[in-house]
Interface confidence: medium
């Protein structure tokens, strides 16, 4: 999983609260875009694990052909396996597909290390386990991969749910959700609750066992609790959000709250960690460090290098602290925090020793590209991608691995001024991160 | 499951030469040691030798140093016991034992050989 | 190479009697000393690692101590199933190094 940092593209937090709470404006939840309550037929429909991706069921083609694709937040092309690799158990055959068009382009996606390049067209496309829909999109056919699929993974492509501002070659290529919400009465949202399982799983349990929802067009209340806390989404290219304060057990980092985001935060399920910018990486360990004390673990545990273990149940979660993400929300000087605990940020490993060690590698990394909120912390909560609203929701996770003492948390309205300074504005040129 | 399967064993005259297989499943054979523990009829234990296939790192015991090579294929994740030069008192049960390496840090303190194979019998005899 | 001298090199008792049994390394491997069991015709199996940690699985009548040069295997209340052959091990430095074995008998 490139060292279980970008699953599969990228290789791999001013304001201060004042404690002084504000009245919630109504207790109702805002009226949303998507219809609510109950996606029966969506809830479980992912499956996968935080080091090797989530991934639903797709069919392409006339006779539809099954495959798996990776739910990746952080990019926005369709690309499907279209030829053999050693990785894949099976690929879209385009010959085989009555409705398939050639749009006659080709498409070249390099990232630091590796890279993938295809044949654009488009088909039908649907989701069994998704809304009762056939869409057509565009299409990338892999026909050749380097370091792109995951041994042992179980998809065969990747789904780019962010903006057509990044999509490749270029933003004239429309994006699969962009195609699903203009071809049908799909509401322009959609919701994601990835499970972590908190404890290494097999193939066989990944492929038995359940990783997550993703409902199409809303949100489903039974995968969370409590509210949902709302921030907005800064720019439509990745699902940029601005953090603005940074807590590790409640102490704040204290950092210029630019550095949080420079050069820029992003929501992104395809990767794995908690991607964090240089100086804040540095400051971020050395709190957690000082929080952990009471054992000691080597510079490799905290560069991800180096798995640390305890033998089986006995993981002193108690010494390690909480990390809290103060948000911009939605209502001028407010925002809301929230919480993970060391049971998403320290990932169990499946690959290890013995089954009689539980082993954990420590998943919050260094980012030269910004704050990447992947799998780690999207494991927390539920989290609402209301594009028709230009904003990102949060609220626990009905799914979220905790104890008995403690528990990851969406809380606020916190007062929080001059919010707007936190974010950074990017010098414009032809940049993507797409190669970091 | 973690196992650990040797493989190889046999008869051999002296002088001659045997190439011993481990193959291991259930484990992250590229971050562990593979060790050769051998055992001669009614006596005890003797390491071999290691090596720990994500660094190519070996150790041998003097004893065989410079007849025995071990090595490792971590695209089969199989550890190999190349012995030549073979001698009578190299007969005994050879087996083969995992260590997590440093890449597994343990809090308190570093594990020992913690899986072992069943064993493979190497008689060296006229 | 460092000697794993252990002792006695062999014992008699009863079930539910404490047995000690003692190896001394040759210079200070600090902790890094296992011990192990064998049963005729079967392979080691770890017992304690780092000189007095438990391995998962084992009994708790199992406990292991000592630091530098001396360290000690005791079973509190011996079994049935633990009549066996014991050894040291000294993981601390290349080459590792077993002791001689502790056969433990029935009286």
């Known amino acids: 999983t490139q060292h279980g940092i970008r699953l599969p593209l990228r290789s791999g937090l001013g304001g201060a609260p004042l404690g002084l709470r504000l009245p919630r404006e109504t207790d109702e939840e805002p009226e949303e875009p998507g219809r609510r309550g109950s996606f029966v037929e969506m809830v479980d429909n992912l499956r996968g694990k935080s080091g090797q991706g989530y991934y639903v069921e797709m069919t392409v083609g006339s006779p539809p052909q099954t495959l798996n694709i990776l739910v990746d937040t952080g990019s926005s092309n369709f690309a499907v396996g279209a030829a053999p690799h050693p990785f894949l158990h099976r690929y879209y055959q385009r010959q085989l597909s009555s409705t398939y068009r050639d749009l006659r382009k080709g498409v070249y996606v390099p990232y630091t290390q590796g890279k993938w390049e295809g044949e654009l067209g488009t088909d039908l496309v649907s989701i069994p386990h998704g809304p009762n829909v056939t869409v057509r999109a565009n299409i990338a056919a892999i026909t050749e991969s380097d370091k792109f699929f995951i041994n042992g993974s179980n998809w065969e492509g990747i789904l780019g749910l962010a903006y057509a501002e990044i999509a490749r070659p270029d933003d004239s290529l429309e994006p699969f959700f962009d195609s699903l919400v203009k071809q049908t009465h799909v509401p322009n949202l959609f919701s994601l609750q990835l499970c972590g399982a908190g404890f290494p799983l097999n193939q066989s349990e990944v492929l038995a066992s359940v990783g997550g929802s993703m409902i199409i067009g809303g949100i489903d209340h039974s995968l969370y609790t409590g509210s949902l806390w709302y921030t907005p989404i800064r720019r439509e290219w990745y699902y940029e959000v601005i953090i603005v304060r940074v807590e590790i057990n409640g102490q704040d980092l204290k950092m210029d709250c630019k550095e949080y985001n420079y050069d820029k935060s992003i929501v992104d399920s395809g990767t794995t960690n908690l991607r964090l910018p240089k100086k804040v990486f540095e400051a971020a360990v050395k709190s957690i460090k000082a929080a952990s004390s009471t054992e000691k673990f080597p510079d490799g545990f905290w560069l991800g290098e180096q798995l640390v273990c305890w033998q089986a149940g006995t993981t002193p979660w108690n010494i390690f602290p909480v990390i809290s993400l103060y948000l911009m929300g939605e209502v001028t000087n407010q925002s809301f925090r929230i919480t993970i605990l060391p049971q998403q940020y320290l990932r169990p490993v499946e690959d290890v020793a013995t089954s009689q060690d539980d082993c954990y590698k420590f998943a919050i990394s260094q980012s030269s590209t910004g704050t990447v909120m992947g799998a780690v912390i999207m494991e927390g909560f539920y989290v609402v991608f209301d594009r028709a609203r230009k904003r990102i929701g949060f609220a626990v996770s009905a799914c979220h691995v905790h104890d008995e003492f403690r528990t990851a948390a969406v809380e606020g309205p916190f007062v929080t001024l001059d919010m707007e300074d936190c974010g950074y504005n990017i010098p414009q040129t032809d940049e993507s991160t797409l190669m970091t | 499951e973690v196992q650990l399967v040797e493989s190889g064993g046999g008869l051999v005259q002296p002088g001659g030469s045997l190439r011993l297989s481990c193959a291991a499943s259930g484990f992250n054979f590229y971050y562990s040691s593979i060790h050769w523990v051998r055992q001669a009829p009614g006596k005890g234990l003797e390491w071999v030798a290691s090596?720990?296939?994500?660094?190519?790192?070996?150790s041998y015991a003097d004893s065989v140093k410079g007849r025995f090579t071990i090595s490792a294929d971590t695209s089969k994740n199989t550890a190999y016991l190349q012995m030549n030069s073979l001698r009578a008192e190299d007969t005994a049960v050879y087996y083969c034992a995992r260590q997590p390496t440093h890449y597994y840090y343990y809090a308190k303190g570093y594990k020992a050989m913690d899986y072992w194979g069943q064993g493979t019998l190497v008689t060296v005899s006229s | 190479d460092i000697q794993m001298t252990q002792s006695p090199s062999s014992l008699s008792a009863s079930v539910g009697d404490r047995v000690t049994i003692t190896c001394r390394a040759s210079q200070s491997v600090s902790s890094a000393v296992a011990w192990y069991q064998q049963k005729p015709g079967k392979a080691p199996k770890l017992l304690i690692s780092?000189?007095?940690w438990l391995y998962s699985g084992v009994p708790s009548r199992f406990s292991g101590s000592g630091s530098g040069t001396d360290f000690t295997l005791t079973i509190s209340s011996l079994q049935p199933e633990d009549f066996a052959t014991y050894y040291c091990q000294q993981y601390s430095y290349s080459p590792f190094t077993f002791g001689q074995g502790t056969k433990v008998e029935i009286k």
């Open positions: 780092w000189a007095s």
């Open positions: 090596i720990s296939p994500y660094s190519g790192y070996t």
